[in-house]
């Protein structure tokens, strides 16, 4: 039976991934009820990707790692739709790095998954990025400007956000 | 997270080849994105080879095109990396590198997108 060998396919799959995530969280995508999309519970998501809050401060290469390490990445911003759903979980008085770095200090900024930067698509405070020692993107609230972005020191520990394509099973 | 160990490297005259090995253990190998990077010295580590976790996808540096090839047997736990034609410009610490994937195609290119690395394999090549 086609229906009972993708149960038992699916169950497999979940019973392998737990190992990295405990607990998914499954929706059916369409009416095809072979098609389940998953992101690892409580990480949200928005259209075809899975974000995760991480509270722990650290640096941005090691947030970078903790991402990796759960099969994601630093969060790369595509779409102004985006950034407004990710902020809904954000805490005004924190701050998170995002997927963005400028290594070399040339005002070369580039996402972590080689997304080309599109100096359209950003959303910098006014006046930022202002240091070229300040190699790290993060996002933050300013109450004159609401959420925009930031460059600051990359050793500078801050919390962060993961951002991953949804799992399908 | 898994342990990476690479083995094959060594002296080799210009114009012969290697086959280096990354052999894994740990979690599902099965489940992890595969690179190969290299630094020689004085140089940033820089990006060789990638592979997906199903094998089914492969990319290369402009470098490695045509003379290196990255393979995969998920149930011996291990990547390869054949590299023919050596040069002495191939010579470098060769480093396999691992990343967790739950995309069968999905390959990785850049190091900071890699969590696990081995110690590193020594490739010298003389004229």
């Known amino acids: 039976n086609f229906m009972y060998s993708k149960t038992v396919k699916r169950l497999s799959k979940l019973r392998e991934y737990q190992q990295y995530h405990p607990s998914l969280t499954c929706v059916m995508e369409g009416k095809d009820i072979e098609d389940w999309s998953c992101c690892p519970t409580p990480w949200t998501s928005f259209q075809s990707s899975c974000y995760f809050i991480s509270t722990g401060m650290q640096s941005w290469t090691k947030s970078q790692k903790n991402c990796s390490v759960m099969g994601a990445d630093l969060v790369v911003i595509n779409t102004r739709e985006e950034q407004d759903f990710i902020i809904q979980n954000l805490k005004r008085n924190s701050s998170y790095f995002l997927g963005l770095s400028d290594p070399g200090g040339r005002r070369h900024w580039q996402w972590v998954d080689q997304t080309p930067y599109n100096e359209n698509v950003t959303f910098w405070h006014s006046g930022e990025p202002n240091n070229l020692d300040e190699r790290c993107a993060i996002i933050n609230f300013r109450s004159s400007e609401e959420w925009g972005w930031n460059d600051i020191h990359c050793h500078v520990p801050q919390k962060s956000i993961c951002k991953m394509k949804k799992i399908y099973i | 997270q898994v342990q990476l160990q690479e083995s094959g490297g060594g002296s080799v005259q210009a114009g012969g080849s290697l086959r280096l090995s990354c052999a894994a253990s740990?979690?599902?190998?099965?489940?992890?994105?595969m690179g190969w990077f290299r630094q020689a010295p004085g140089k940033e580590r820089e990006f060789v080879a990638t592979?997906?976790?199903?094998?089914?996808?492969?990319d290369y540096a402009d470098s490695a095109k045509g003379r290196f090839t990255i393979s995969r047997d998920n149930a011996k736990k291990t990547v390869y990396l054949q590299i023919n034609s050596l040069k002495t410009e191939d010579t470098a610490v060769y480093y396999c590198?691992?990343?967790?994937?739950?995309?069968?195609?999905?390959?990785?290119?850049?190091?900071?997108?890699?969590?696990?690395w081995g110690q590193g394999t020594q490739v010298t090549v003389s004229s």
């Open positions: 590198a691992a990343r967790l994937s739950f995309d069968n195609t999905a390959f990785y290119t850049s190091a900071i997108r890699y969590s696990d």
């Open positions: 740990g979690r599902t190998f099965s489940d992890y994105a």
């Open positions: 592979i997906s976790k199903s094998g089914s996808s492969t």
